[in-house]
């Protein structure tokens, strides 16, 4: 806590401007008028006060508004905003695009930071839902932002904001993510013509249901590989070779390369070796001719 | 890409002055403060002076106050230490410097200019 | 705020961890920052408070601390990292340089 002194003569500040560098941590604690600090934030930023500083004004402002600073305020922290515990935050009532891109802006280059993480949530909590401009938003400053947010939370993500997605905000999203996400793409996408939906579905596959790999492998798509690779491995266990040779198309002949690996491994032990010796491709591992494969899951439904 | 350079430094007598100059280029100079920081021989660094923006607010280290005037002329890019009443100890390698806002750091420098104050 | 710098000098081969340290005074929060000076050159920013790595810094340089006591570490040696460094605060006016670290080949 700064101690409360008198504001020696002719120091008492009438604007926020460069002078104040040169006020002592007493000084400005003395001479500053809250109030004016409140209209004149924007002036801040083009100020270099040091973090002793910074941390007396911050201070001024939790003084003046305990129960939270005023979105007029929070618009305008800019570098202060650095300053702010999540706690500090959680006090806040942000309900502008505006002010939380204003935010991320001083934020820009870094990882998400708790501060950060908290505003997000509490703008997120204020609207309802994940809209598709905030989603805009937050992709454009956090690329990963999509895949930290749990599958409960990406269930209030309408289909239309969907749009907004890019195929890198999903890199880091693991298979349940994909899994919610998968059908708003497939319903915010459904109006697309073959080639033109594939493009656009192809980075939330990790998501598809068999019958629509299925589908897809009817429309002359020739998915890459890496798209492949990261497949449900239930969805790609019941496809046929003649199906997985259709959706792949020609990068059939990357198949030789990740056969040790999922989810083609697996696929491999479930295909009868003669099946697989049609792609030419020395596939080993599959059913050996003469065997007889009993699908104990449809056994089990039927009883 | 951010470019500075000095001039000016060179030897000169205990008592006499000098004039150093730096030109910079490769952004908008008037949006920044500005630093003169310097490097005595084999020593440390040591922060001399900073100019704002605008230049209507000037720091100097107390080692200089009095001796040192720091100015800008924004129109020419160029930053200015005009160094008076130069002493011994003032032998240095001069830096200018770009300063951030947030935070307060130096984050482009010049080659610096050396400045020899000998009899 | 003065700063001290340990060791003044070390000795390191390729491949070596190193650790510098920069002690303040007083208590600088998080207000520090690390510069690299190689003979003849003007030195470079490295990090910034306490521990955000400068834009085009290689990630084996890395900081750490809060308060008073703040680590320099640069996780392993390569030729172009013989140098000086330097710490800085901006906590509080007049901004300082500790009396730097000079890495040297063993």
């Known amino acids: 806590e700064v101690e409360k002194t008198a504001c020696p003569s002719g120091k008492k500040a009438r604007e926020i401007d460069e002078s104040l560098i040169f006020y002592k941590k007493w000084e400005l604690e003395a001479c500053v008028d809250a109030a004016l600090l409140a209209t004149q934030m924007d002036r801040v930023n083009a100020i270099p006060f040091t973090y002793e500083q910074l941390d007396v004004l911050k201070h001024k402002l939790d003084e003046l508004y305990p129960q939270g600073y005023p979105e007029s305020v929070i618009q305008h922290l800019g570098y202060l905003f650095l300053k702010m515990s999540p706690e500090d935050i959680r006090k806040w009532n942000v309900t502008s695009l505006e002010t939380l891109k204003a935010l991320l802006e001083v934020n820009k280059g870094h990882e998400m930071s708790p501060q950060v993480a908290t505003l997000i949530d509490r703008f997120v909590k204020g609207r309802g839902q994940l809209d598709k401009d905030t989603l805009d938003t937050l992709t454009a400053f956090y690329p990963g932002y999509l895949c930290s947010l749990s599958p409960e939370e990406l269930s209030s993500v309408p289909p239309s904001s969907i749009w907004a997605v890019r195929p890198q905000d999903l890199d880091t999203c693991d298979p349940r993510q994909l899994d919610v996400l998968y059908p708003k793409a497939r319903l915010a996408f459904q109006n697309m013509n073959g080639s033109e939906y594939f493009v656009k579905i192809q980075s939330f596959l990790g998501g598809a249901p068999t019958e629509d790999l299925k589908a897809l492998s009817q429309q002359n798509v020739s998915m890459d590989l890496a798209t492949f690779m990261k497949l449900r491995t239930d969805a790609v266990l019941p496809l046929t070779v003649a199906e997985v040779q259709k959706l792949l198309g020609p990068h059939v002949e990357g198949l030789k390369a990740e056969e040790r690996h999922r989810p083609v491994r697996d696929w491999i032990l479930r295909q009868r070796q003669d099946d697989l010796d049609t792609l030419g491709l020395g596939l080993q591992g599959g059913i050996p001719n003469g065997y007889l494969v009993l699908d104990l899951s449809m056994q089990e439904a039927l009883s | 890409q951010v470019q500075l350079v000095e001039s000016g430094g060179g030897l000169v007598k205990p008592g006499g002055s000098l004039r150093l100059s730096c030109a910079a280029s490769g952004f908008t100079f008037s949006d920044y403060y500005m630093s003169w920081i310097r490097q005595a021989p084999g020593k440390g660094l040591e922060w001399v002076s900073y100019i704002s923006s605008s230049g209507s607010t000037i720091y100097y280290a107390d080692s200089v106050k009095g001796r040192f005037t720091i100015s800008r002329d924004n129109a020419k890019n160029s930053l200015y230490l005009q160094m008076n009443s130069l002493r011994a100890e003032d032998t240095a390698v001069y830096y200018c410097?770009?300063?951030?806002?947030?935070?307060?750091?130096?984050?482009?420098w010049g080659q610096g200019t050396l400045v020899t104050v000998s009899s | 705020i003065q700063l001290t710098q340990s060791p003044s000098s070390l000795s390191a081969s390729v491949g070596d961890r190193v650790t510098i340290t920069c002690r303040a005074s007083q208590g600088i929060s998080s207000a520090l920052a690390w510069y690299q000076q190689k003979p003849g050159k003007a030195p470079k920013l490295l990090i910034y408070d306490a521990s955000s790595l400068e834009s085009g810094v290689p990630s084996r340089f890395s900081g750490s601390g809060s308060g008073t006591d703040f680590t320099l570490t640069i996780s392993s040696l390569q030729p172009e990292d013989f140098a000086t460094y330097y710490c800085?605060?901006?906590?509080?006016?007049?901004?300082?340089f500790g009396g730097g670290t000079k890495v040297e080949i063993k």
């Open positions: 800085q605060q901006f906590n509080s006016y007049p901004l300082t």
């Open positions: 410097a770009r300063d951030l806002i947030f935070p307060v750091v130096f984050d482009y």
